[in-house]
Amino acid sequence: GSERTCCPVNWVEHERSCYWFSRSGKAWADADNYCRLEDAHLVVVTSWEEQKFVQHHIGPVNTWMGLHDQNGPWKWVDGTDYETGFKNWRPEQPDDWYGHGLGGGEDCAHFTDDGRWNDDVCQRPYRWVCETELDKASQEPPLL
């Protein structure tokens, strides 16, 4: 595949990555799948600077990111190391709260109103953000 050199239409370029901000909601798994079909992934926040950029674009709305612990430990969808990486949880989060009555705990992370993170029930239909790296080889065949 060819290397992507500019962002697709309706995506926002920032620091060699492209971001797409949904205006509707999906369950985490559906949002994750949507991004994959766009040759992207749910946003992975690796710095305070990236956090502020995403926060500015989503506004005060619960929004999914590419972080989950559905298989045990917390993991970023692109393989970025969670333990040593950037974190911005709200106080006392994540708490894997079971009291919501929807079944199970809370295994998916989202941005809250003030940008800090919370874990919530993965089936809630929150907005989401896709990200893809400009330097990454795209899946599209090169133009002949």
């Epitope: 509707s24 619960n62 709200r90 006392e92 708490d95 709260w97 874990d119 089936q123 809630r124 239909p125």
Partner: antibody, heavy 123, light 112 residues
Amino acid sequence: QVQLVESGGGVVQPGRSLRLSCAASGFTFSAYGMHWVRQAPGKGLEWVTIIWYDGSYKYYADSVKGRFAISRDNSKNTLYLQMNSLRAEDTAVYYCARTGVDPWDYYNGMDVWGQGTTVTVSS
Amino acid sequence: DIVMTQTPLSLSVTPGQPASISCKSSQSLLHGDGKTYLYWYLQKPGQPPQLLIYATSNRFPGVSDRFSGSGSGTDFTLKISRVEAEDVGVYYCMQSIQVPWTFGQGTKVEIK
């Protein structure tokens, strides 16, 4: 304008079935989770059930679990409540209501309600 | 289930005077996202309920600024600064942090 109109209520004998409908207009129905809430004569409000915007998830009050089924047809902008094995205590006005304020946040309360349809279960 | 308890159950108010309704929940309504999921509804005679206040203190668009909501955790209050004739009806609090959604028993407000 935003409107919800319930229909299908009536008098039914205990043990029988009834299907309620709620026709939505004036908003993008397929973007909203939808509730049924009921109110027995002279009593307060009781939440009955919710369905996700795409029908993928449904939850019920214990009092109706296994007897009532919520469904929706987004192509027809219509919400349904199939009520089976009806009991006298199911007698109530049934309201449909949409998740409000932000359609993509189901912690939200209900912001728009229909006028209700009356179900009477009596022999 | 979360139990919502309202007091008083009825209230008779002189027009122009303030009124206050209390709602207590059996569990905290503060969610991990920092919001507190408590709602206030008014059901006028012969009508469906209408949303007044969402997430504890936010007035729903079109609702008079005579209505205000406050509180945190398990204790909440709805205040009407100056009661008018059109405010008569039954007021309900409701929580949405846990399924099932649950309502208070209702507070009937009438004009003296």
